[in-house]
Interface confidence: low
């Protein structure tokens, strides 16, 4: 015979074809062997011109031989080489599917591999590829979009060889609040680590605001709107700066009166103040807290005290905000100017958390009068807010 070729090669099969001998022959003897694979020999009829090779090992180079027989006579042997495909991984499955994460698992192919190519694609056409090592049989997908259909595919790699892809389809869980309007809704979405989050004022995706969420204090879900901790940020700022906000959300900052107004206009909010000084801690919670709009000069409403720091904010209830360039307090002097800060001053303050850091002169520092008086500047202070009914929501969420 002549012209021995192989076709239709897969990971376990191939088809051998040849040109028949010119003379009539009784049979053809076909043998094939590969590395670490014992030789297999088959005899087929003399009028056959192809033979299906089955049960082959994947990713293996085979040597195929064929000769013709007529009675006791044998023709010369012709040879061809071919390599089987790499077999695919098996049983690709998505488990532990959450709103933004999923775990892909699979069983390895029979052939040895040098790695795997993972491709996952969302319905909107976003495609991501990742190559993982040969001993890996699972991979955690992160940063997925909630309520989204995904197709995940995997392909085994062995040097230049690539297996067929197998795939699985899964859908991420929908977020309870796709556009959380505060840190409590972010928390109810399952985010439980304190840090930077994007919230959406009134749940409007066009009104995005980056905030720091305290997810640990008293059950979490707090938007932090003021932090004093080291004196690096200048809090002696003008009206415009206090309206807009300033500082680094991870460090010392003020979130901004406009933002506070918009947030507290979303519903009923409570205020929490956490204070720390030389290992001592104190807190104050007010179950009704709101900040008016610019027309009211960001008028403060704060009621319903509980805590350990003392009710110093009651003195400021109903007051408008004051800065050195916009004096709205009831004192003869300009409180903000006198105390180098800004606040809902009255005449002038029992609370001065935006005062001069580390200044222990009377009323100049970071003061909470009913805890440390007017002549002690507190080392650490945070003001934060969350919905007043958070406990109720959280309790219902846990129980229902």
């Amino acid at each position: 015979p002549s012209g021995l070729v192989t076709a239709n090669i897969t990971d376990s099969e191939a088809l051998a074809r040849w040109q028949p001998a010119i003379a009539t022959v009784d049979s053809y003897v076909i043998s094939y062997t590969g590395e670490k694979v014992p030789e297999i020999t088959r005899t087929v009829s003399g009028n056959t011109v192809e033979y299906a090779l089955t049960d082959l090992e994947p990713a293996t180079e085979y040597t195929l031989r064929i000769f013709a027989e007529k009675g006791p006579q044998k023709s010369s042997t012709i040879t061809a080489k071919f390599t089987t495909d790499l077999d695919s991984p098996r049983d690709l499955t998505a488990t532990e599917v959450q709103s933004e994460t999923a775990l892909l698992t699979w069983r390895p192919p029979r052939a040895s591999v040098t790695g795997y190519l993972l491709v996952y694609e969302s319905v909107d056409g976003t495609v991501k590829e990742v190559i993982v090592g040969p001993d890996t049989t699972s991979y955690s997908l992160a940063d997925l979009s909630p309520s989204t259909h995904y197709t995940a595919k995997i392909q085994a790699l062995n040097g230049p060889l690539r297996s067929n892809m197998i795939q699985t389809i899964f859908t991420t869980i929908g977020l309870l609040y796709p556009f959380p309007k505060d840190c409590s809704q972010a928390m109810l979405n399952g985010d439980t680590t304190s840090g930077l989050y994007t919230i959406y004022l009134n749940g409007d995706k066009a009104e995005a605001l980056e905030v720091f969420c305290d997810m640990t204090s008293d059950g979490g879900g707090w938007i932090v709107f003021l932090r004093r901790k080291n004196g690096r940020e200048n809090f002696y700022q003008n009206w415009k700066a206090y309206a807009a906000g300033f500082g680094d959300r991870r460090e010392e900052f003020w979130l901004g009166l406009d933002n506070l107004n918009k947030i507290t206009a979303q519903g009923q909010y409570e205020l929490r103040v956490d204070l720390r000084d030389h290992g001592e801690t104190a807190f104050a919670v007010y179950d009704k807290f709101s900040v008016g709009d610019a027309k009211t000069r960001y008028k403060l409403k704060v009621e319903g005290y509980s805590g350990t720091a003392g009710d110093s904010m009651a003195y400021h209830n109903g007051r408008s905000f004051s800065t050195f360039d916009k004096d709205t307090d009831s004192a003869i002097t300009n409180c903000a100017l006198s105390y180098k800060g800004a606040f809902w001053y009255r005449n002038c303050h029992r609370v001065n958390l935006m005062g001069r850091y580390g200044d222990n002169n009377h009323s100049q520092g970071v003061n909470w009068f009913h805890w440390k008086g007017h002549e002690h500047s507190i080392q650490f202070a945070e003001m934060k807010l969350r919905p007043s009914n958070f406990r109720n929501l959280e309790g219902r969420r846990k129980r229902a």
Epitope: S147, G174, L176, L188, G203, G395, R396, A400
Partner: antibody, heavy 119, light 107 residues
Framework: EVRLVQSGAEVKKPGASVKVSCKVS????????MHWVRQAPGKGLEWMGG????????IYAQKFQGRVTMTEDTSTDTAYMELSSLRSEDTAVYYC????????????WGQGTLVTVSS | DIQMTQSPASLPTSVGDRVTITCRAS??????LNWYQQKPGKAPRLLIY???TLQDGVPSRFSGSGYGTDFTLTISSLQPEDFATYYC?????????FGQGTKVEIK
């Protein structure tokens, strides 16, 4: 599993009041957000009022304001809906339903109570 | 108050059909929308909450989509037990109004 069992059918005269009860089992009433929905014969669903976790209070649809009172007896885990000054158009099946988690979706429903207002 | 408008009011259809019901809110309600199914003489049953989240035990042929003011309930392949009336409900803020209902009936 929450189960809501409502009181039986009532026939009332125009101008009278009716009080429908809804007994909760499987959970305590304090753990749930109770709502009332009615459905006139051959008509759609009409939300009457219920506990709004957002405000922490019971709110009523404008249409029923002043005529409806929703109360709870936590000692017996029973909710009540009282509708006064009844008129013929108040003939309907009245359902109690509880809201799921903080999604406010009405997950569990009573079997309904038919209130007929007729002279 | 937020008004909810469903269309169509009735939908003659056959088993195996793909069914789409729309619901429009008179104001922006984000994704705060529920869908219910009601059969004659029975209490309503929650199908989908938060616009697209399938309630436990509801077959996957039901799906919800939409955001803001326009929402859709889809039944990918109608089954005999799906002939019923479907209602959308605003859950953005009280009063939590329902749509007027869409009756899916046999053609």
């Amino acid at each position: 599993e929450v189960r809501l069992v409502q009181s039986g059918a009532e026939v009332k005269k125009p101008g009278a009041s009716v009080k429908v009860s809804c007994k909760v089992s499987g959970y305590t009433l304090t753990e749930l957000s109770m709502h009332w929905v009615r459905q006139a014969p051959g008509k759609g669903l009409e939300w009457m009022g219920g506990f709004d976790p957002e405000d922490g209070e019971t709110i009523y649809a404008q249409k029923f304001q002043g005529r409806v009172t929703m109360t709870e007896d936590t000692s017996t885990d029973t909710a009540y809906m009282e509708l006064s000054s009844l008129r013929s158009e108040d003939t309907a099946v009245y359902y109690c339903a509880t809201a799921q988690k903080e999604t406010y979706a009405l997950t569990y429903w009573g079997q309904g109570t038919l209130v007929t207002v007729s002279s | 108050d937020i008004q909810m408008t469903q269309s169509p009011a009735s939908l003659p259809t056959s088993v195996g059909d793909r069914v789409t019901i729309t619901c429009r809110a008179s104001q922006y309600i984000q994704g705060f929308l529920n869908w219910y199914q009601q059969k004659p003489g029975k209490a309503p049953r929650l199908l989908i909450y938060a616009a697209s989240t399938l309630q436990d035990g509801v077959p996957s042929r039901f799906s919800g989509s939409g955001y803001g003011t326009d929402f859709t309930l889809t039944i990918s392949s109608l089954q005999p037990e799906d002939f019923a009336t479907y209602y959308c409900q605003n859950q953005y803020r009280g009063p939590w109004t329902f749509g007027q209902g869409t009756k899916v009936e046999i053609k």
